[in-house]
């Protein structure tokens, strides 16, 4: 059945050479004496992407990441001499790496380090106005960076500074025991979650950060930090990890006499990302990665999207899962978890709760409290002993809209963006991978916005060597993505249309709501362009529906290269096809010479298919004629490629190969007639490559080909030797090198 | 007013127990986490022990782990000290302190202290 | 032999200005812990004199003020008085193990 194409694969998958040769892909390699590229702040008014990295802050022009100016912010020789001595590692602990950038004011940002295990934070002077072209550090204003910072680079910090506060989940120590949420700045005393009790924090991962609206009145505002973290004794058989959303009021100030300058208003919830297995065994995603928040219309409900990944070693896979904040907010106005001592189960808290119920904020709307430092003792005693709620979260139709566990990497970043198309309104996923990879997923809707479809439209490789994703922005104004890495950063168009193809089909069956067929291209689409002129499907991405009256028109890739091709009896010949999309099936008719029907190929011991093509072995005469290669996608069937082969007996081959190219027997004539001078020369190369007695290797081979191609190149500055580069492709082949073929500029490659 | 009165100390032979109560007074004994800090004759401080408010947490110096068990009884507000395989070098006057947790960033300090009890391990 | 330390000992005249120093080391002054110092009046149990480096409990005189800096803090008294004879402790936060840790102690004798 060709109908059912590949969708748990990317249509395209792009390598890194082909992202630079294609211009979809701009990189800043990292400095040498710097490197985690982790921390990004994004400013879309100035054009600028702000990024920490060891020892230094970038300021990087969105139009053009080459174009940048940098902060270099190391520590004192002295604190990097206490680090060493204190047993740290001088290159990979005993610097300067930047865990906090966040907007401070109009004017200033504020950033923070972990200073060589003694954090450290200060302000960064941008100026007023992107003109002013101001990006300094206020050297005379540094702050203690504890509660801020980690001190240990390799520990993650989620923070959000909003009215002059900060809100930190980091560790407050040195030895990374004493993790926390924190707010400092401003001119409040510091608050904190309450330390020495795992039920608040059970050696978490901060991942991010976010303020979220509860109402119109700013009072009812929360933080919401997500985190994984243990799974609390009792919760759990074993060890295990959770993924966490934690909630407390902006406006909590702690208690009285109880929880003093501690979160009176601090929960938690988990998580659930996992899929429905045999016997009522789900397999969890518990290992929260990363986490996005699409604000669309209403800011009191951004849609979360969250990253999963597995905690077990044995089976690796990736999820992505969406969850409501009303949803999240159900869980939190529901059931504390409860257990009556650390050998009990938990169960839902079946008591009398306090009024007002813990964890709401102390506003007009929900109660008649001013602070938390007015609650009742009842309260705060509860809240304190009472931090997580019984029910998880769920996702979204109770199920991740990604999942990947075939492959041999894992989710680490995603970004989202909403784009209007002809159908609707679909959310594009971009995924960033720990190989170095981004996959660019739209998730579509089947038969009720519900039921979602995942679809891989590209798999890009963005850095050189296999890194890890650990940060990602993304720009609506500059419709560009930005990722960061160990390495350096990268940037990258949100949609590359072109590289779909030339024809109407294969940009319907690319179904990329950024893309549609224009009447001569696939090009961007924009809502408020003529519908009539514009052709796309992201529902469907059907293209018999929808290019139907182009079909005739051949001039946009529909009629398929020919090739004629010669085989010798007895030995084998390879007929290469592979389609540009990675998601079509391909199929090989074979038509007998001078025969109207056409027979689909049936794969034997005589005839092997491989990704590439077709590898026919011990050719026979009756192996000539032509061969049609068919490419199926979603319904649609476009024939890329006809191949004529003619077989040659035995007893010629002499005969032709010591023929000069220009001597005058009448069966090389006759051969050569529909042959061009390059394929000629191509010809003469593979026969000697079968037979040549004094050619051991391929190797040997090719060095003479090419030195032969480099005199003709001198003799005749005019001939370009259409298949000089035959070979080469053929050794890049052998050195293990991934290809696939997009056009079919060479001859066919004949083993 | 703050109390902390502690009570339990005594002379004991080399692998005897004891077990030291601290009785407290004047505020939210349940909100607090305590500790026993000792000082040997002549010499300087040294924290011997931790508890949180809910017993979540439970910390020792090396020098005691493994023989010495810290607990608290809420409902009696009263924090205890047990104490096995007793030592000549644990001889020290043992003081119940409560944490304050005063400075800005949470470092465990003792703002209150009783008048402490003396434990004499001698054969 | 303690984390923290100390001078064993330090004297000044009545009205003078003497000064304690505590040196510790990145893991604990260090890494940023703050450092309190105590009180310990001959045969008294100890009082907390001074709070997050620098701040005085209500009832301590403003005689009495602390400072810290790097892998150090101090502790000075200034218009000293007979009364402020004691032994001085020095204590910060370590982390694990152990939780904390004081120094070794300082006696001071009003001359």
């Known amino acids: 059945n060709y109908q059912n194409g590949k969708n748990n694969v990317p249509r395209l998958k792009l390598s890194y050479k082909e992202m630079l040769e294609s211009n979809n892909v701009i990189t800043f390699n990292g400095l040498a004496n710097s490197s985690s590229y982790h921390t990004f702040l994004l400013d879309e008014e100035r054009s600028r992407l702000y990024v920490g990295a060891k020892d230094h802050i970038f300021s990087f022009d969105l139009v053009n990441i080459k174009d940048f100016q940098k902060i270099v912010w190391p520590v004192s020789y002295t604190r990097r001499d206490e680090c060493k001595w204190a047993g740290k590692d001088i290159l990979k602990e005993c610097a300067n790496f930047i865990k906090v950038l966040k907007a401070y004011n109009q004017t200033h940002l504020y950033a923070c380090g972990t200073g060589a295990f003694h954090p450290i934070c200060t302000y960064i002077e941008i100026g007023h106005h992107p003109e002013d072209n101001i990006f300094k550090l206020e050297n005379s204003h540094f702050e203690n960076g504890r509660g801020k910072s980690p001190y240990d680079p390799k520990l993650l910090t989620a923070s959000l500074l909003i009215d002059g506060e900060l809100y930190s989940g980091t560790a407050a120590d040195f030895m990374g025991r004493d993790f926390a949420i924190f707010r400092t700045l401003g001119h409040h005393h510091p608050i904190r979650t309450e330390q020495h009790d795992s039920r608040w924090l059970n050696d978490p991962k901060f991942i991010s950060a976010h303020l979220i609206s509860e109402s119109d009145n700013p009072e009812d505002d929360k933080v919401y930090f997500f985190f994984r973290e243990n799974a609390i004794d009792g919760e759990h058989s074993g060890k295990a990890t959770h993924a966490r959303i934690g909630q407390i009021c902006k406006n909590d100030f702690g208690g009285h006499r109880s929880l003093v300058n501690k979160w009176t208003t601090f929960l938690k919830a988990r998580l659930i990302c996992s899929v429905p297995g045999p016997n009522g065994i789900d397999t969890h995603f518990d290992e929260l990665q990363d986490v996005f928040l699409m604000n669309f219309k209403d800011p009191k409900n951004p849609v979360v999207y969250g990253v999963f990944t597995t905690s077990s070693n044995i089976f690796k896979g990736s999820a992505v899962c969406m969850y409501s904040m009303s949803d999240v907010r159900r869980v939190f106005l529901g059931p504390y978890a409860h257990r009556d001592g650390p050998n009990y189960q938990w169960v839902p808290y079946q008591g009398r709760v306090p009024y007002p119920r813990p964890g709401t904020c102390p506003s007009k709307t929900f109660g008649g409290f001013d602070s938390t430092k007015d609650l009742p003792d009842d309260v705060i005693t509860f809240a304190r002993s009472h931090p997580a709620m019984y029910n998880p979260v769920f996702p979204m139709n109770n199920r991740p809209i990604v999942i990947k566990t075939d492959v041999n990497y894992q989710f680490t970043q995603i970004v989202v963006d909403r784009v209007d198309a002809e159908d609707g309104q679909y959310d594009v996923m971009f995924i960033g991978t720990d190989v170095g990879t981004v996959l660019k997923v739209v998730s579509i809707p089947k038969e009720t916005w519900y039921d979602l479809e995942e679809v891989l439209l590209e798999e890009m490789t963005v850095f050189r060597e296999p890194t890890a994703i650990s940060a990602m922005e993304l720009s609506t104004k500059q419709q560009q993505l930005y990722i960061g890495s160990t390495a350096g950063v990268a940037q990258l168009p949100l949609h590359r249309c072109d590289i779909y193809g030339k024809a109407c089909a294969e940009c319907c069956l690319a179904r990329d709501p950024y893309c549609a067929w224009d009447g001569s291209a696939c090009s961007r689409y924009f809502p408020t362009a003529k519908r009539r002129t514009r052709r796309q499907d992201i529902r469907n991405g059907d293209p018999l529906t929808h290019c139907s009256d182009l079909h005739h028109d051949n001039h946009h890739g529909h009629s398929p290269e020919e090739r004629i091709i010669y085989g010798v009896e007895n030995s084998s010949t390879f007929l290469e096809c592979s389609p540009k999309s990675q998601r079509a099936l391909v199929y090989w008719q074979f038509q007998r010479r001078n025969e109207e029907r056409k027979e689909e190929i049936r794969v034997d011991d005589h005839i092997i298919r491989t990704d590439q093509g077709l590898l026919l072995r011990s050719l026979q005469q009756k192996d000539s004629g032509n061969y049609l290669c068919h490419a199926v996608e979603h319904g649609f069937i476009q024939t890329l490629l006809k191949v004529t082969l003619e077989v040659i007996d035995t007893e010629h081959l002499e005969e032709l190969l010591h023929k000069d190219d220009d001597g005058d027997g009448s069966k090389t004539k006759e051969m050569s007639n529909s042959m061009t001078p390059s394929q000629k020369v191509w010809y003469r190369d593979f026969m000697q490559l079968i037979n040549h007695p004094n050619l051991n290797t391929m190797d040997e081979f090719c060095e003479q080909v090419w030195k032969r191609d480099r005199k003709q190149r001198r003799q005749r500055p005019g001939h370009t030797p259409g298949n000089s580069n035959k070979w080469k492709h053929l050794q890049e082949n052998k050195k293990g090198r991934n290809r696939r073929t997009h056009e079919f500029e060479r001859a066919p490659r004949s083993v | 007013e703050v109390q902390l009165l502690e009570s339990g100390g005594g002379l004991v032979q080399p692998g005897g127990s004891l077990r030291l109560s601290c009785a407290a007074s004047?505020?939210?004994?349940?909100?607090?986490?305590m500790n026993w800090v000792r000082q040997a004759p002549g010499k300087g401080l040294e924290w011997v022990s931790g508890?949180?408010?809910?017993?979540?947490?439970?910390d020792y110096a090396d020098s005691v782990k493994g023989r010495f068990t810290i607990s608290r009884d809420n409902s009696k507000n009263t924090l205890y000290l047990q104490m096995n395989s007793l030592r000549a070098e644990d001889t020290a006057v043992y003081y119940c302190?409560?944490?304050?947790?005063?400075?800005?960033?949470?470092?465990?300090?003792?703002?209150?202290w009783g008048q402490g009890t003396l434990v004499t391990v001698s054969s | 032999q303690s984390v923290l330390t100390q001078p064993p000992s330090v004297s000044g005249a009545p009205g003078q200005r003497v000064t304690i120093s505590c040196t510790g080391s990145?893991?604990?002054?260090?890494?940023?812990?703050?450092v309190h110092w105590y009180q310990q009046l001959p045969g008294t149990a100890p009082k907390l004199l001074i709070y997050?480096?620098?701040n005085r409990p209500s009832g301590v005189p403003d005689r009495f003020s602390g400072s810290k800096s790097g892998t150090s803090a101090s502790l000075a008294i200034t218009g000293l008085q007979a009364e402020d004879e004691a032994d001085y402790y020095c204590?910060?936060?370590?982390?694990?193990?152990?939780?904390?840790?004081f120094g070794g102690g300082t006696k001071l004798t009003v001359l």
């Open positions: 302190a409560r944490s304050g947790y005063s400075s800005s960033w949470f470092d465990p300090d003792f703002d209150y």
């Open positions: 004047g505020f939210d004994f349940d909100s607090y986490e």
């Open positions: 508890i949180s408010w809910n017993s979540g947490w439970i």
């Open positions: 990145s893991s604990n002054i260090g890494a940023g812990y703050d």
């Open positions: 997050g480096n620098s």
């Open positions: 204590q910060s936060y370590a982390g694990p193990n152990p939780y904390v840790v």
